[in-house]
């Protein structure tokens, strides 16, 4: 959850791709002003998830969740929170 | 800001070889079914995407990482 908070648009796009929902992907790509060739490229990635079925999507989602909640990322998130707190304290 | 480990995973998915990508996934989830799935997806992406497609996908990632929503 903490990692999703750090870059929500990334997880929006990732889960739209992995979910196989083209409308959802279009909506999330609009948020970053993706061009037509960029949308086409992302849809090609999405096609791979769709072609490989639900199990494939679940397994890859599991990988992303595992990495995002790993000590590599959580340590980073904690460090960022500490930095934020320091900046907020100094700002007062 | 995106976690470096996530960035590495995505970069390898787009620009690494299948072996490089699967090796990275194995560091986090070493289940055979997960690794086989990772290889299938990676091979599929490599087969579908041209050099230009990959440049465009990397451009989307740049936009994501520099977005106010990240």
């Amino acid at each position: 959850v903490k990692m999703a908070e750090t870059c929500p648009i990334f997880y929006d796009v990732f889960f739209a791709v992995a979910n196989g929902n083209e409308l959802l992907l279009d909506l999330s790509l609009t948020k970053v002003n993706a061009t037509e060739p960029e949308r086409t490229a992302m849809k090609k990635i999405q096609d791979c998830y769709v072609e490989n079925g639900l199990i494939s999507r679940v397994l890859d989602g599991l990988v992303m969740t595992t990495i995002s909640s790993s000590k590599d990322c959580m340590g980073e998130a904690v460090q960022n929170t500490v930095e934020d707190l320091k900046l907020n304290t100094l700002g007062r | 800001e995106i976690c470096p480990a996530v960035k590495r995973d995505v970069d390898l998915f787009l620009t690494g070889t299948p072996d490089e990508y699967v090796e990275q996934v194995a560091q986090y989830k070493a289940l055979p079914v997960v690794l086989e799935n990772a290889r299938i997806l990676k091979n599929c992406v490599d087969a579908k995407m041209t050099e230009e497609d990959k440049e465009n996908a990397l451009s989307v990632l740049d936009k994501i990482y520099t977005s106010p929503l990240c």
């Epitope: - | 590495r8 970069d11 390898l12 690494g16 070889t17 995407m49 050099e51």
Partner: antibody, heavy 119, light 107 residues
């Protein structure tokens, strides 16, 4: 025109250090993985290192691990190879080479820069 | 590490000859193999990638074949500008090893 140009080679004593540079032009540098490859006098090609477009992953050959460090500055379209604890066997022509995104081959090479390690 | 061996290491041929160079990998590398040509004092030049795909601008007399552990580079009719050293390289996994090279010389 897609181009890579190496610089920074020279004569250095064993145990010394040297920093090689590779300037890129004609393509979106930040998207591409770049390799360093070397060739000792009269010998074959030896892969040295690879750095990804965003520096998120880096690989080294065992022969240079712990002694060489690769880095890049995408804002300057530049790649670097910091070589420390140099040995006589590091004497070679050093090339930087772009790795393609789709087939992982080295499609564009620099002209090379010569490093000589000798006392 | 994946080892690559090339045969022959040295080859004498005449203009117009058909030349075949073989590269063996110590383990399967699918089609992740490239061939490069290098002339003295020059950087290597990509000829073939993905085992059999001709790089843009490379003459059609060059061709590649093979998959898994055995690969070949063929020059159908050797031209004067083809006298050089040829290297295979595996792109499957790091370290991205090169073969020891095959020097093609004038007979």
């Amino acid at each position: 025109e897609v181009q890579l140009v190496e610089s920074g080679g020279g004569l250095v004593k064993p145990g010394g250090s040297l920093r090689l540079s590779c300037a890129a032009s004609g393509f979106t540098f930040r998207n591409y993985n770049i390799n360093w490859v070397r060739q000792a006098p009269g010998k074959g090609l030896e892969w040295v290192s690879l750095i990804s477009g965003s520096s998120s992953y880096i690989y080294y050959a065992d022969s240079v691990k712990g002694r060489f460090t690769v880095s890049r500055d995408n804002a300057k379209n530049s790649l670097y190879l910091q070589m420390n604890s140099l040995r006589a066997e590091d004497t070679a022509v050093y090339y930087c080479a772009r790795r393609t995104l789709s087939y992982y081959v080295m499609d564009v090479w620099g002209q090379g820069t010569t490093v000589t390690v000798s006392s | 590490d994946i080892q690559l061996t090339q045969s022959p290491s040295f080859l004498s041929a005449s203009v117009g000859d058909r030349v075949t160079i073989t590269c063996w990998a110590s383990q399967g590398i699918s089609s992740y193999l490239a061939w490069y040509q290098q002339k003295p004092g020059k950087a290597p030049k990509l000829l073939i990638y993905s085992a059999s795909t001709l790089q843009s601008g490379v003459p059609s007399r060059f061709s590649g074949s093979g998959s898994g552990t055995e690969f070949t580079l063929t020059i159908s009719s050797l031209q004067p500008e083809d006298f050089a050293t040829y290297y295979c390289q595996q792109l499957n996994s790091y370290p991205f090893t090169f073969g020891p090279g095959t020097k093609v010389d004038i007979k």
